[in-house]
């Protein structure tokens, strides 16, 4: 069973009194409706809460919203609805919070029918004051901030116009009509697709991809016959319709669309889709859907150019376009990803990779757990993680897996132990080494969050009954203590803590229900007195990530280097603090063939690490040969894995081959792209 409250657990002394002095209740004196919460800035303590209430009347909908502001991490709230003239705010647009610590907020208001345009309320001072601005259009999407300059906003209108503001929403200019999708790129560049013949849906596959680098003064058409496009890391992707049939292919650019290369990926038909699962500046994980309504596809990982792809994982669960996939980046350890596969018998199993998709394996069975009824062999089974798919299937899973970059190695997730994911009520499991080993942490489903960079884990039981107890652990989930935060239980609706897991505050949201009234309520608990002192050097210990065998000279080497971290000792009850920076020391590893992927036209035979030339090019390899760019067809068979930093050791140099000779048709040069000014 999971470790719990027993005499073996290290206790935090006098914690009830310490927490009681730091528990703050706020009752929201309005009718219970939906509550949305946003943090404004980092380490500012500013929270905005929007409560909305709808009454559908026969002719129209009556709506009321209230806006509250806290500047002490949710301990106290002030009703600031008057700052937005008591206007009803549209929750579907949420609160558009500016990037970094800009202090900018945009709220989109509901306006009465027949008005010329929409209305927004803008703040540049962390929601202390708001300015009302009437828009010359009705917004279709939330305002999008440029990542580089928070004064630059873009929005799409209900008429499919692309609107830009250069002064934080004060003045707006329509820079293009007939726009389907628009995104900010780097350096204040905007990418967008346009239609010619009536609508986005009608023109799907015949859209044009445009770019403006000067906020709409001039434009360049960078793609035609576009189905869709996406940005990931330094890569710009477009799925482009083929000339001869209804299939489409991925093209990739690393220079903002000036030049394109065809990706060596299978083409897809009308009912299939591509999806960028994850991307960074080194590489991309791409899902390619299988033909037919299978609910699965294949994950491919790219080279550093985003052009050559290696098959990473078969039968990857991904239901439909925009549907559910369990693909999760474990942000607490480099190179680790978790996802689900649909096995031949239609059961769902969890897989994990520790080397950025190079190899996938099942999750190790937790030492303190038994195999469940799904296991054929009661001694041999794996942990299976519940993520987005389970949540979408309405299983008793209140939260997706959780990891934080500054809580090194920690992963928390719901799961079951057997041969596949079970529909039975799950338990909560924790890993402290990035997914290599797991322990049952809590019995039954819970909400959970990480505070103080892993110094505290907080959990609340998922229950249909009202609750008044919170659990917390100061030793990475080994031992738990319970605190009754209110005498009168509340119907729980959510757990909120400041993004980034540096905070010591947790807010428990819910509502109270009596005979006639229902009120929203929050309890904010500050754990600062539980962790009384600041952590010192002696509170940390050294940990080697990805260590599996100390007798192996290259133990811990992943993508060509190993990393040692200073980690908080489980027995240390102290504050990492808001300014905590993960201390790590990398050391470069010697290269082996594992540090290289096979270039186009080469493959690895099973159980062999050498890349061997393909005897003949078939399928999408042949298409790449025909339509790929000339310089990509010259290779020595190996390419270093993106992000791999190894040095010395094996250097697989062999003669450079020109694969053009294998292509059975002349090379087709890509079409020239046209430019035009506004």
């Amino acid at each position: 069973s999971a470790p719990g409250e027993d005499e073996e657990c290290g206790r935090v002394r006098d914690f009830v009194a310490k927490l009681a002095n730091n528990t703050h209740q706020h009752v929201f004196d309005d009718l219970r409706g939906s509550v949305s919460l946003s943090w404004v800035g980092d380490s500012t303590g500013v929270i905005l809460v929007l409560t909305t209430f709808h009454v559908p009347l026969v002719i129209m909908t009556f709506g009321q919203s209230k806006l509250y502001r806290s500047e002490d991490y949710g301990k106290n709230f002030k009703d600031i609805t008057d700052l937005i003239n008591n206007t009803f705010i549209r929750t579907e647009f949420g609160m558009a919070i500016g990037p970094e610590n800009s202090g900018k907020v945009v709220l989109t208001a509901e306006v009465s029918g027949g008005s010329r345009g929409g209305r927004i309320f803008r703040s540049s001072d962390f929601a202390k004051n708001f300015v009302q601005t009437d828009l010359p259009f009705h917004p279709l999407t939330q305002m999008m901030y440029s990542p580089q300059n928070s004064d630059y906003l873009l929005a799409l209108s209900t008429e499919n116009g692309l609107w830009v503001s250069k002064n934080f929403g004060g003045k707006w200019e329509e820079i293009h009509k007939a726009v389907c999708l628009a995104k900010w790129g780097s350096d204040n560049t905007i990418f967008f697709t346009t239609y010619a013949n009536g609508s986005c849906k009608a023109d799907l596959g015949a859209l044009e991809l445009w770019r403006t680098s000067d906020l709409g003064k001039s434009f360049k058409t960078i793609g035609v016959k576009i189905y869709s496009f996406g940005l990931g890391g330094r890569f710009l992707f477009a799925s482009v319709m083929a000339d001869k049939d209804t299939t489409r292919r991925i093209h990739v650019s690393t220079d903002q669309g000036d030049t394109w290369s065809m990706a060596q990926l299978p083409s897809v038909g009308q009912e299939q889709f591509y999806s960028i699962l994850a991307a960074n500046d080194d590489m991309v994980f791409m899902h390619v859907d299988e033909p037919g309504d299978t609910g699965f596809g294949t994950i491919f990982t790219s080279d550093d150019r985003g052009i050559v792809y290696s098959k990473s994982l078969d039968r990857h669960l991904y239901t439909t376009t925009g549907g559910e996939t369990d693909f999760t980046n474990v942000t607490s350890l480099r190179g680790v990803y978790i996802t689900s596969v649909l096995s031949e018998d239609n059961s769902i199993q969890t897989m994990i990779t520790f080397d950025q998709g190079g190899r996938w394996t099942h999750l190790r069975k937790p030492e303190n757990s038994e195999c469940d009824a799904t296991a054929k062999n009661k001694n041999e089974c794996s942990l299976h993680i519940h993520a987005s798919y389970s949540i979408s299937q309405k299983l008793n899973v209140p939260m997706a897996p959780l990891s934080e970059p500054n809580a090194v190695g920690i992963v928390i997730a719901h799961g079951s132990v057997g041969d596949a994911i079970s529909v039975m009520v799950p338990d909560v499991y924790i890993s402290d080494d990035g997914g290599y080993s797991w322990t049952k942490m809590l019995e039954g489903p819970h909400y959970y969050t990480i505070l103080d960079s892993g110094g505290i884990i907080v959990a609340i039981e998922h229950s249909s009954r009202p609750i008044n107890v919170i659990k917390f652990s100061t030793d990475e989930g080994q031992c738990w203590q319970t605190y009754t935060f209110t005498r009168d239980p509340i119907y729980f609706t959510g757990l909120a803590s400041e993004p980034g897991a540096r905070s010591m505050n947790i807010s428990i949201w819910g509502f109270t229900e009596s005979f006639l009234t229902s009120q929203a309520v929050s309890y904010t608990i500050d754990f600062k007195d539980i962790l009384e002192r600041n952590c010192e050097e002696k509170d940390y210990t050294i940990w080697l990530a990805h260590s599996t065998d100390p007798e192996d000279y290259e133990d811990g080497c992943i993508l060509g280097y190993k990393e040692q971290f200073l980690r908080l000792r489980k027995s240390s009850v102290c504050q990492n603090g808001r300014d905590y920076v993960v201390t790590k020391q990398p050391s470069i590893c010697l290269c082996s063939l594992e540090d290289f992927l096979c270039d186009f036209g080469y493959y690895r035979p099973e159980n062999d690490s050498k890349c061997v030339e393909q005897p003949e090019l078939k399928g999408h390899d042949l298409e790449f040969c025909l339509y790929g760019r000339e310089e990509h067809l010259t290779t020595n068979g190996y390419r270093k894995i993106p992000g791999d930093k190894c040095q010395g050791g094996v250097n697989p140099v062999r003669e450079v081959k020109d694969l053009k000779k294998k292509c059975t048709s002349n090379f087709l040069s890509p079409e020239k792209q046209n430019s035009k000014s506004n």
Epitope: T541, S547, Y553, Q564, S571
Partner: antibody, heavy 124, light 106 residues
Framework: QVQLVQSGAEVKKPGSSVKVSCKAS????????ISWVRQAPGQGLEWMGG????????NYAQKFQGRVTITADESTSTAYMELSSLRSEDTAVYYC?????????????????WGQGTTVTVSS | DIQMTQSPSTLSASVGDRVTITCRAS??????LAWYQQKPGKAPKLLIY???SLESGVPSRFSGSGSGTEFTLTISSLQPDDFATYYC????????FGGGTKVEIK
């Protein structure tokens, strides 16, 4: 089989320094922490500090902070412990020991391989 | 630093006896405890790590238990070779040893 071989006995004057070496053979020296433990005549064991050869991360017991320096040379698979400002109470057998390791944590699994010990006598 | 208190400091026993030595930590150390055996003029030898895991090559009559602050080393049937001094050692703070327990012939 891993072995740790320490340098020979030393006789030192109060106020001077001593440097004891510990050479590893037959294993991956770089992947394990090396601890230094001393034992005064008729007394118990006392941990002085340790080092991880990769990166050279050293940490010391509070009692010896500022007086002990632990280093490692990966190329020769040798760890060193230097103790300065010697006094008569430092007369002891000094052991180096390899910290066993089953996971990424360097110091959590006990000391599974020990050197033969080096006797240091501090006398005027 | 975490203090380790070992008891008893001396223990008289006969061959075949079941022997128990306890070790108490001044604060919780989870399971991060090791036990050593030391004979005069020799280096210590690791018997148990992580409170209850037996080091390879160590006879199964040695066992460890406990977690948090209370730990026990048990020798199920004392053998002539087992007369020695035993030390516990915590590894979750800066390493500290217990004062030792001398097991002598009754």
């Amino acid at each position: 089989q891993v072995q740790l071989v320490q340098s020979g006995a030393e006789v030192k004057k109060p106020g001077s320094s001593v440097k004891v070496s510990c050479k590893a053979s037959g294993g991956t020296f770089r992947n394990y922490a090396i601890s230094w433990v001393r034992q005064a005549p008729g007394q118990g064991l006392e941990w002085m500090g340790g080092i991880i050869p990769i990166g050279g991360w050293a940490n010391y017991a509070q009692k010896f902070q500022g007086r002990v320096t632990i280093t490692a040379d990966e190329s020769t698979s040798t760890a060193y412990m230097e103790l300065s400002s010697l006094r008569s109470e430092d007369t002891a057998v000094y052991y180096c020991a390899r910290q066993g390791r089953k996971t990424g944590y360097y110091y959590y699994y006990g000391m599974d391989v020990w050197g033969q010990g080096t006797t240091v006598t501090v006398s005027s | 630093d975490i203090q380790m208190t070992q008891s008893p400091s001396t223990l008289s026993a006969s061959v075949g006896d079941r022997v128990t030595i306890t070790c108490r930590a001044s604060q919780s150390i989870s399971s991060w405890l090791a036990w050593y055996q030391q004979k005069p003029g020799k280096a210590p030898k690791l018997l148990i790590y992580k409170a209850s895991s037996l080091e390879s090559g160590v006879p199964s009559r040695f066992s460890g238990s406990g977690s948090g602050t209370e730990f026990t080393l048990t020798i199920s049937s004392l053998q002539p070779d087992d007369f020695a001094t035993y030390y516990c050692q915590q590894a979750d703070g800066h390493i500290t040893f217990g004062g030792g327990t001398k097991v002598e012939i009754k």
